[in-house]
Amino acid sequence: EEELQMIQPEKLLLVTVGKTATLHCTVTSLLPVGPVLWFRGVGPGRELIYNQKEGHFPRVTTVSDLTKRNNMDFSIRISSITPADVGTYYCVKFRKGSPENVEFKSGPGTEMALGAKPSAPVVLGPAARTTPEHTVSFTCESHGFSPRDITLKWFKNGNELSDFQTNVDPTGQSVAYSIRSTARVVLDPWDVRSQVICEVAHVTLQGDPLRGTANLSEAIRVPPTLEVTQQPMRVGNQVNVTCQVRKFYPQSLQLTWSENGNVCQRETASTLTENKDGTYNWTSWFLVNISDQRDDVVLTCQVKHDGQLAVSKRLALEVTVHQKDQSSDATP
């Protein structure tokens, strides 16, 4: 004759307030004859949760039909879970006896605990922009989860980061917990289109972690490089000078030309293009009139990027005698 085993497969059952919890219990033998009851807790103070034969248990239903002669499944469902329902639940086999049934064997128990999903992680970046090669900090916060065990990972694009610190509060027992993590990220010049991702894994999420993201475009300032060149071709009595402002971000940029220290008010042609990495290029053309009185012309292209200190590049104009001689020529 096979010895009776009481199988409660889940050691821990996480449930959410208001939902229905299923407590599993199966037996391996129909003998000895007698009922299976459910209790919360152990010892003389244990609370009867379900007895098929007697009592009123409005929130409890059975998974299987217990009236069937060969039934071996004594699982129950408890509806409308509240915080008061937490505890360890035991299914207990009784042997039929007289005048009363005698406890024969107990299952190992299933601990019912309230599980609460973490809120969607919120990632916040630095208040001010920083240039490449510097380190910036991002924080990630998620709240309201239970139990306390939680895993948090940081990624920059697809690559996991290791430089971060995480705290879960409170340290003691609580209905719900919060997590806060701060990651340090080194900015690369091509990070305009990059993201930092905070990933939170918790038992209530069934293996589908929550993610919060922040765009590094909000945190990075890529300073421009400047180049001023004189075009070899002359347009009538004018020389074309180009100021190329390359690889900057964000787009906010002010460009001014000055001739021998005097700021030029006249309009110049310009184009703005976006690079593949999200940075910008700005090209400005400046036409300088050539005349005999203009021997030493120094042109300065000055750029103020994103409220930073202005940077400038100078060019001493090379006007050959031949060009001066031709400067009065009519242009077609």
Epitope: N157, W190, R193, Q195, K247, T273, E274, N275, D277
Partner: antibody
Framework: QVQLVQSGAEVKKPGASVKVSCKAS????????INWVRQAPGQGLEWMGW????????GYAQKLQGRVTMTRDTSTSTVYMELSSLRSEDTAVYYC???????????????????WGQGTLVTVSS | DIQMTQSPSSLSASVGDRVTITCRAS??????LGWYQQKPGKAPKLLIY???NLQSGVPSRFSGSGSGTDFTLTISSLQPEDFATYYC?????????FGGGTKVEIK
């Protein structure tokens, strides 16, 4: 499935221009950059440049600057590559190729080319 | 421009052989490297991206390794359909450049 279908073979005289088309299907046209690569007979692969079909931004190989122009027509999901002032050394098979989407890992922000057109043979001969 | 040097330029091998092709960059390119297979009259096909990641649909006998300047493409057990020309390509800097190619022929 992703497909890039190019226009047919062309024979051109030196000094002329050629315009090769590349029609994309099976994916969101504006999400992926298109690159052009050419291959002279019996030779290796030479990159010509890229185009962003969403913004119209382009980047060309220095060697071809001033001779190559890439344009697009978003209504037909087609990218065009025009090469002017043709010379005999431009004789090659011209491929359009979709650039694999991904984060930038360098300032070029280029990525490998995951889908290619069937190629268009352009012959430059007097 | 970044020069990509492939070796050998050609090799003869038999079905079932383990084949290794190397590619060297003239400067550090991190892991911004792809490997392509090209058969006569056909367009190149991407096999490996980011030096070691297998492109979707590519058999697992192809693998890539390396970082910085030295990279390797390995075919663990050569199959009849693998006889082709293989190119490496850097995507670290403009212009994107390819190696000269390695022709894998039947021994």
């Amino acid at each position: 499935q992703v497909q890039l279908v190019q226009s047919g073979a062309e024979v051109k005289k030196p000094g002329a221009s050629v315009k090769v088309s590349c029609k994309a299907s099976g994916y969101t046209f504006t999400r992926y950059d298109i690159n052009w690569v050419r291959q002279a007979p019996g030779q290796g692969l030479e990159w010509m440049g890229w185009m962003n079909p969403n913004s119209g931004n382009t980047g060309y190989a220095q060697k071809l600057q001033g001779r190559v122009t890439m344009t697009r027509d978003t209504s037909t999901s087609t990218v065009y590559m025009e090469l002017s002032s043709l010379r005999s050394e431009d004789t090659a098979v011209y491929y359009c190729a979709r650039e694999r989407v991904g984060y930038c890992s360098s300032t070029s922000c280029l990525h490998p080319l995951d889908y290619w057109g069937q190629g268009t043979l352009v012959t430059v001969s007097s | 421009d970044i020069q990509m040097t492939q070796s050998p330029s050609s090799l003869s091998a038999s079905v079932g052989d383990r084949v290794t092709i190397t590619c060297r960059a003239s400067q550090g390119i991190r892991n911004d490297l792809g490997w392509y297979q090209q058969k006569p009259g056909k367009a190149p096909k991407l096999l490996i991206y980011s030096a070691s990641n297998l492109q979707s649909g590519v058999p697992s006998r192809f693998s890539g390794s390396g970082s910085g300047t030295d990279f390797t493409l390995t075919i663990s057990s050569l199959q009849p359909e693998d006889f082709a020309t293989y190119y490496c390509q850097q995507s670290y800097d403009v212009p994107l450049t390819f190696g000269g190619g390695t022709k894998v022929e039947i021994k």
